[in-house]
Interface confidence: low
Amino acid sequence: ATCYCRTGRCATRESLSGVCEISGRLYRLCCR
């Protein structure tokens, strides 16, 4: 599956590590 980090209103960022993490905090991840 390809996973994406959701940022802002419409940007999608592919997450290669399979997590969306900033400074140890996890954020919304969408995998499809």
Partner: antibody, heavy 119, light 111 residues
């Protein structure tokens, strides 16, 4: 150490196509994205798009859709950008840059490739 | 697209003094309590170099003379004290929304 080595300067005719390369070393190529950025002489920076070498997935700035095509070869750790239907507006320095994972900024840059489009 | 407006376009500062560069976004670049604004330094004939990421985080190897602050739409890069090696053009860049965009640049010179 992380390095992005770009191909040499190019001179191309209007209407032609050109393929620029960016060879990565010093890190796992498939663990980061690669973006391409355009800079016209004496001007600012424009994000063209990015490719994730592991999946081959690409994301483009709408402005450059149909102009730029991004590809990557995992076996040689090299990213490519093909520019088509060249005009004088495409004359610029093109940089490749490594994308930080997930919430990206550009943490390492190639030295740039100068493209001159002239008849 | 999010438009980033930098000011001033050029700046002359005496050695040892403080340089302040502003970047204003046409809409908020904040998400999840973080600001997705970054700063780069570019010297003639060289690629840009990352200085500050997510508004206020100093990139590894960058001197502590460089600092960043701000949130939502208003951001500042401060260099204090300015050294001769800081002569360059400075760009802000947002990654909160596609397409990623850059400011027009601020050229720093020594007075």
């Amino acid at each position: 150490q992380v390095q992005l080595q770009q191909s040499g300067a190019e001179l191309a005719r209007p209407g032609a196509s050109v393929k620029l390369s960016c060879k990565a070393s010093g890190y796992t190529f498939t663990s980061y994205g690669i973006s391409w950025v355009k800079q016209r002489t004496g001007q600012g920076l424009e994000w063209i798009g990015e490719i994730y070498p592991r999946s081959g997935n690409t994301y483009y700035n709408e402005k450059f859709k149909g102009k730029a095509t991004l590809t990557a070869d995992k076996s040689s750790s090299t990213a490519y950008m093909q520019l088509s239907s060249l005009t004088s507006e495409d004359s610029a320095v093109y940089f490749c840059a490594r994308d930080y994972d997930g919430f990206p900024y550009f943490d390492y840059w190639g030295q740039g490739t100068t493209l001159t489009v002239s008849s | 697209d999010i438009v980033l407006t930098q000011s001033p376009a050029s700046l002359a500062v005496s050695l040892g003094q403080r340089a302040t560069i502003s970047c204003r976004a046409s809409e908020s670049v904040d998400s999840y309590g973080y600001s997705f604004m970054h700063w780069y330094q570019q010297k003639p004939g060289q690629p840009p170099k990352l200085l500050i990421y997510r508004a206020s985080n100093l990139e590894s190897g960058i001197p502590a003379r460089f600092s960043g602050s701000g949130s939502r739409t208003d951001f500042t890069l401060t260099i204090n004290p300015v050294e001769a090696d800081d002569v360059a053009t400075y760009y802000c860049q947002q990654s909160n929304e596609d397409p990623r965009t850059f400011g027009g640049g601020t050229k720093l010179e020594i007075k």
